[in-house]
Amino acid sequence: REPTVQCGSETGPSPEWMLQHDLIPGDLRDLRVEPVTTSVATGDYSILMNVSWVLRADASIRLLKATKICVTGKSNFQSYSCVRCNYTEAFQTQTRPSGGKWTFSYIGFPVELNTVYFIGAHNIPNANMNEDGPSMSVNFTSPGCLDHIMKYKKKCVKAGSLWDPNITACKKNEETVEVNFTTTPLGNRYMALIQHSTIIGFSQVFEPHQKKQTRASVVIPVTGDSEGATVQLTPYFPTCGSDCIRHKGTVVLCPQTGVPFPLDNNKSKPGGWLP
């Protein structure tokens, strides 16, 4: 039978660490991490790490009992957890019978938004107590709400990941810029900022009709040339406060008729601010 892995939590040092080993298995040949989605009962889904590793193809894998994987996450707070993956059989060959290296994976470490993870793995038995053993580590930075997978998470939807404000902005005259955008039922307060290397104008927008999508319009006084300036729209939603996803547009000249500039010439540009 071919070896498989059985993985479970192991928070402290592995018991083998206390024992003296004449020989230990070699290090891993490769270690990779990628996010995968799994649905959960609430109708939302969670993002988990798929940690996969490749064993070095030589006789030292005959000594291999397990591989231990530890993950440290750094964002607002630090997290640390480890799993030990035991091999169900001794290795009878250095490569898979069908060809290629022995490759295993573990899916289970949860992934939070916008977090840097340090994933380390080592084979067991590992080095003796006062020796450095072979190990391998990789970094993985989880994406934020702008990511094509993450944006459908409930937390991100509530932070406006699926909201497209369709910003249009045009220079009415030397002193004012008209900004139009589609509101969202997620919140009723917005800040429109006009920047041309420095901030040349801003306005708070309060939209009382929170329950339905409407097209809001605001005329903003400016203190400098606004043509080509960037409009930044910051929403204030209950779930993300002042840290919601920001959207951008560009100021163009208003048409002579005085109506706002058509949408298709000025696509909204997602900003880089994430919850």
Partner: antibody
Framework: EVQLVQSGAEVKKPGASVKVSCKTS????????MNWVRQAPGQGLEWMGR????????QYAQKFQGRVTLTRDTSISTAYMELSRLRSDDTAVYYC???????????WGQGTLVTVSS | DIQMTQSPSSLSASVGDRVTITCRAS??????LAWYQQKPGKAPKLLLY???NLADGVPSRFSGSGSGTDYTLTISSLQPEDFATYYC?????????FGGGTKVEIK
């Protein structure tokens, strides 16, 4: 029946390169590492390196690093060993040898004599 | 690199004799050892692997023993076709090395 059939004898001048082929049959080529071993006249066996035909991972003996190149062509189940900057002490019989479950050499080619002479 | 030291480098024996060849590794190779037989002008032939396992078609008069760093190949009753050179090889991990060989000659 597992067979490893090597290319014929070569005579080369110092500084030249030689490429030896090893055509395999009777087993799944990508399932076993292929090793190269040489034997100078009247001398013992010397391991040069190995290649995993599955993904072309290669490991060389330090002595040959930078001078030997191992390749493979899975479409014709053939492994190759190229040795460059030949010297007279590279005169030897070169063998391909297929690994077993681990790196004992279960099957050998018939050998290719490479003579380096000016 | 692991060094493999074989002894003796040559020996003379008669048909029917019991022959023992030893191989010492410079460090523990955890029984990852193979023995080969080579006749003049021919490729080596695998005799034993994992110290004691006979390769396909190898007569039972060949046997192996040992562990750690010290290993032995024994031919219980030497036959005329056994006159050849014998090599040990470790496969604990690359680079793989062979012993210097033991030539078994007719007395």
């Amino acid at each position: 029946e597992v067979q490893l059939v090597q290319s014929g004898a070569e005579v080369k001048k110092p500084g030249a390169s030689v490429k030896v082929s090893c055509k395999t049959s009777g087993y799944t080529f990508i399932s076993y590492w292929m090793n190269w071993v040489r034997q100078a006249p009247g001398q013992g066996l010397e391991w040069m390196g190995r290649i995993d035909p599955y993904d072309s991972e290669i490991q060389y003996a330090q002595k040959f690093q930078g001078r030997v190149t191992l390749t493979r062509d899975t479409s014709i189940s053939t492994a190759y060993m190229e040795l460059s900057r030949l010297r007279s002490d590279d005169t030897a019989v070169y063998y391909c040898a297929r690994s077993g479950g681990f790196d004992w050499f279960a099957y050998w080619g018939q050998g290719t004599l490479v003579t380096v002479s000016s | 690199d692991i060094q493999m030291t074989q002894s003796p480098s040559s020996l003379s024996a008669s048909v029917g004799d019991r022959v023992t060849i030893t191989c010492r590794a410079s460090e523990n190779i955890n029984s990852n050892l193979a023995w080969y037989q080579q006749k003049p002008g021919k490729a080596p032939k695998l005799l034993l692997y994992d110290v004691t396992n006979l390769a396909d078609g190898v007569p039972s008069r060949f046997s192996g023993s040992g562990s750690g760093t010290d290993y032995t190949l024994t031919i219980s009753s030497l036959q005329p076709e056994d006159f050849a050179t014998y090599y040990c090889q470790h496969f604990w991990g690359p680079p793989y090395t062979f012993g210097g060989g033991t030539k078994v000659e007719i007395k």
